[in-house]
């Protein structure tokens, strides 16, 4: 008996194939011989069965021998044994049909865990095999659950279903809804501008919600609220921003902060939080800010940072030009009695420079 | 916890003032906006006024303007509503509420203090 | 000032019973919407933000639904603690103003 795997709303091709390359009768029949179609005449004719109005016959190849039944907008009840009766012999052919469906909406939050279910015919042992878009495999049964979504995780999964060494390969489209980075750093000179950028790693037609920036500043003892905003089929409006700093925003997306001025007090880690409409739960992006300041204070040339800098960041002080240099792995280095010229001081990450900052040093006379 | 706890209602004749005042703990209230609700007795519920976290930016519904004055000490975690020019319908339980989150729902509520104006 | 009308104004229900109280803004507001329960003599507690989140804590059976104008709670399977006076509030614009209310009724 042949194997044919369908797909669930599909169309399949049952074929038939007489031994004589010419017109003849043939039926098709259902396990319980309830006949669905065949030929009278040089007219194809329908029978009783559930299938009557979704299933047809390529008349332009009976002359060639060919009597294949398709049936359209597959259902899983579909599946049975057909019976193909021509030239005095039948031809059994065994239809399984398939269904496999994400059990939620297809477009979810990062970290939300996707469950995909296979719906199967009574009697069938199938077994199924997904590959995410990023190349993740993960196999099981009648249900595929991936618990922690990513956002590489977006895409085209390919699904295989395997009954009796046939296959059919399923495709479904996730949207993995989340920011481009989960974590991003801004190096700045004091007094500099600072701009914030979240951009999504989806495309939606319609986007709407609301979010804010909670700001934990490194010489601050708690968070607090820095801006709530809006967002309304990807317009931003600003609903609360706090007084100092009095943060802008851009009116589209990507969603972008503008912080007039980087100074010591305002370093620190954010965390920008969107709710999306109909969506349980948040998108999160980590924000840092880490401020430079180079400063002459009598006899002494300091330079400091403040913000969330990592223990193997170096802080140098080097004079222009001159080998006079002095490194630490420290959020602060000075030098006394400096020498006159333009000094840098530097911010450093494995020898690759993340912010510099010039001070000229005038001679005392 | 988060804990807010009114003071200072009671009985005042119309025309007569009184100071309304919230005590906040269990939480950094130098970083929320704090709200004023009221309730008058067998009724419903009525925003009053709110304040952002510096004492900056207040606002009141029509019906309290010039007559109610919202304010905050950080230092000592205290929200206050100074209530001037009292009438009959001001009557009601006063809660203070804080304002949490992106949605600016009121999260936590304390459980009131009653003004009844009356002469 | 944005008007929010509950309706209806009280229900008479029984333990197990789906629940459905409205809410309707007079202008659009978005998801601005929260909903509270108050039981007699307690304080407000929010059960919802942003017309649809749920405060932690807070029983599944509860949901919130809709956006602009036309607002939902949906009191799933009513439990006996959940007989109380249900309040919508909108925070698109000041001043914020509440609905009237819907009490739920034990039948």
């Known amino acids: 008996k042949k194997v044919v795997l369908g797909k669930k709303g599909d169309t399949v091709e049952l074929t038939c194939n007489a031994s004589q390359k010419k017109n003849t009768q043939f039926h098709w029949k259902n396990s319980n011989q309830i006949k669905i179609l065949g030929i009278q005449g040089l007219f194809l004719t329908k029978g009783p069965s559930k299938l009557s109005d979704r299933a047809d016959s390529r008349k332009s190849l009976w002359d060639q021998g060919c009597f294949s039944m398709i049936i359209k907008n597959l259902k899983i009840e579909d599946s049975d044994t057909y019976i193909c009766e021509v030239e005095n012999k039948k031809e059994e052919v065994e239809l399984l049909v398939f269904g496999l469906t994400a059990n939620s909406d297809t477009h979810l939050l990062e970290g939300q865990s996707l469950t995909l279910t296979l719906e199967s015919p009574p009697g069938s042992s199938p077994s199924v095999k997904c590959r995410s878009p990023g190349g993740k495999n993960i196999q099981g049964g009648r249900t595929i659950s991936v618990p922690q979504l990513e956002r590489q995780d977006s895409g085209t999964w390919t699904c295989t279903v395997s009954q009796d060494q046939k296959t059919v390969e399923f495709k479904i489209d996730i949207v993995v809804l989340a920011f481009q980075k989960a974590s991003s750093t801004v190096y700045k000179k004091e007094g500099e501008q600072v701009e914030f950028s979240f951009p999504l790693a989806f495309t939606l037609e319609k986007l709407t919600g609301s979010g804010e920036l909670w700001w934990q500043a490194e010489r601050a003892s708690s968070s607090k609220s820095w801006i709530t905003f809006d967002l309304k089929n990807k317009e931003v409006s600003v609903k609360r921003v706090t007084q100092d700093p009095k943060l802008q925003m851009g009116k589209k997306l990507p969603l972008h902060l503008t912080l007039p001025q980087a100074l010591p007090q305002y370093a620190g880690s954010g965390n920008l939080t969107l709710a999306l409409e109909a969506k349980t739960g948040k998108l999160h992006q980590e924000v840092n800010l880490v401020v430079m300041r180079a400063t002459q204070f009598q006899e002494n040339l300091t330079c400091e940072v403040w913000g969330p800098t990592s223990p193997k960041l170096t802080l140098s002080l080097k004079l222009e030009n001159k080998g006079a240099t002095v490194s630490k792995q420290a959020k602060a280095v000075w030098v006394l009695n400096p020498e006159a010229g333009m000094w840098q001081c530097l911010l450093s990450d494995s020898g690759q420079v993340l912010l510099e900052s010039n001070i000229k040093v005038v001679p005392t006379w | 916890e988060v804990q807010l706890v009114e003071s200072g209602g009671g009985l005042v004749q119309p025309g007569g003032s009184l100071r309304l005042s919230c005590a906040a703990s269990g939480f950094t209230f130098s970083s929320y906006w704090m709200s004023w609700v009221r309730q008058a007795p067998g009724k419903g519920l009525e925003w009053v006024a709110n304040?952002?976290?510096?004492?900056?930016?207040?606002n009141y519904v029509d019906s309290v303007k010039g007559r109610f004055t919202i304010s905050r000490d950080n230092a000592k975690n205290s929200l206050c509503l100074q209530l001037n020019s009292l009438r009959a319908e001001d009557t009601a339980v006063y809660h203070c509420?804080?304002?949490?989150?992106?949605?600016?729902?009121?999260?936590?509520w304390g459980q009131g203090t009653l003004v009844t104006v009356s002469s | 000032d944005i008007q929010m009308t509950q309706s209806p104004s009280s229900v008479s229900a029984s333990v197990g019973d789906r629940v459905n109280i409205t809410c309707r803004a007079s202008q659009g507001i978005r998801s601005w919407l929260a909903w509270y329960q108050q039981k007699p003599g307690k304080t407000p507690k929010l059960l919802i933000c942003g017309a649809s989140s749920l405060q932690s804590g807070v029983p599944s059976r509860f949901s919130g639904s809709g956006s602009g104008t036309d607002f939902t709670l949906t009191i799933s399977s009513l439990q006996p603690e959940d007989f109380a006076t249900y309040y919508c509030?909108?925070?698109?614009?000041?001043?914020?103003?509440f609905g009237q209310g819907t009490t739920v009724e034990i039948k």
């Open positions: 509420a804080r304002e949490g989150g992106q949605w600016l729902a009121l999260d936590y």
């Open positions: 304040i952002n976290e510096d004492g900056s930016e207040k």
């Open positions: 509030q909108q925070a698109n614009s000041f001043p914020w103003t």
